[in-house]
Amino acid sequence: HSDGIFTDSYSRYRKQMAVKKYLAAVLGKRYKQRVKNK
């Protein structure tokens, strides 16, 4: 962090969670679309 107070550990964890959440949403949307098209 620019302020030097914090490690980057927690923000890294949260970024990883955000990516997983985004991918889950995208994959979920694709799956729903596939089911809809059948």
């Epitope: 490690t7 923000s11 990883q16 969670m17 997983k20």
Partner: antibody, heavy 108, light 112 residues
Framework: AEGGLVKPGGSLELCCKA??????????MCWVRQAPGKGLNWIGC????????DYATWVDAQFTLSRDIDQNTGCLQLNSLTPADTAMYYC??????WGQGTLVTVSS | AQVLTQTPSSVSAAVGGTVTINCQSS???????LSWFQQKPGQPPKFLIY???KLASGVPSRFSGSGSGTQFTLTISGVQCSDAATYYC?????????????FGGGTEVVVK
């Protein structure tokens, strides 16, 4: 954050202001409570950047987190309070920097 | 929901001795995101160790952490009177599947 005595069924908002640094997108404000003589209990966290929040399952919509990045502040809204919610409430940034805590007592 | 079990709940140590505190997680914590905190009466918790084994800034080297997955350990070597406190572990989990965080029940360290 201002705590104090609240009647059962009442509401209270606790707020925490970061000083000495500015909240950024790298910061999450988390809230933890500790009943008298008991252990630490995670309540939830809110992103200073996006405002996205997540909560412990047990919270069950009783509590709500908010933040104002311009004011460098995060708040915890406590609703439908019962004596079981009597505790010291701590705010923490990324679990690294902790506030001194505020005691909330729920009693008639 | 996830559970972090800390053992023992209380431990006594002589000055200069060694204390070992265990933290067992179910399920596994996410990618070794396990932290340790020290709390003294009337004070907020103090950040000691993050990512299982990394020492926070200003924490004495007599504190060390180890472990991965479901089993973690905090060790205090050369215990000092000032180490008398309650210690907590905190796990970070895959938020999509469970709560993001859980604390262990705490371990009280008494220094003789």
């Amino acid at each position: 954050a201002e705590g104090g005595l609240v009647k059962p069924g009442g509401s209270l908002e606790l707020c925490c202001k970061a000083s000495g640094f500015s909240l950024t997108t790298s910061h999450w404000m988390c809230w933890v409570r500790q009943a008298p003589g008991k252990g630490l209990n995670w309540i939830g966290c809110i992103s200073a950047g996006s405002g996205d929040a997540d909560y412990a399952t047990w919270v069950d919509a009783q509590f709500t987190l908010s933040r104002d990045i311009d004011q460098n502040t995060g708040c915890l809204q406590l609703n439908s309070l019962t004596p079981a919610d009597t505790a010291m409430y701590y705010c923490t940034i990324n679990f690294e920097l902790w506030g001194q805590g505020t005691l909330v007592t729920v009693s008639s | 929901a996830q559970v972090l079990t800390q053992t023992p709940s209380s431990v006594s140590a002589a000055v200069g001795g060694t204390v070992t505190i265990n933290c067992q997680s179910s399920p596994s914590v996410y990618s070794s995101y396990l932290s340790w905190f020290q709390q003294k009466p009337g004070q907020p918790p103090k950040f000691l160790i993050y990512e299982a084994s990394k020492l926070a800034s200003g924490v004495p080297s007599r504190f060390s952490g180890s472990g991965s997955g479901t089993q973690f350990t905090l060790t205090i070597s050369g215990v000092q009177c000032s180490d008398a406190a309650t210690y907590y572990c905190l796990g970070a989990y895959d938020c999509g599947r469970t709560d993001c965080h859980a604390f262990g029940g705490g371990t009280e360290v008494v220094v003789k």
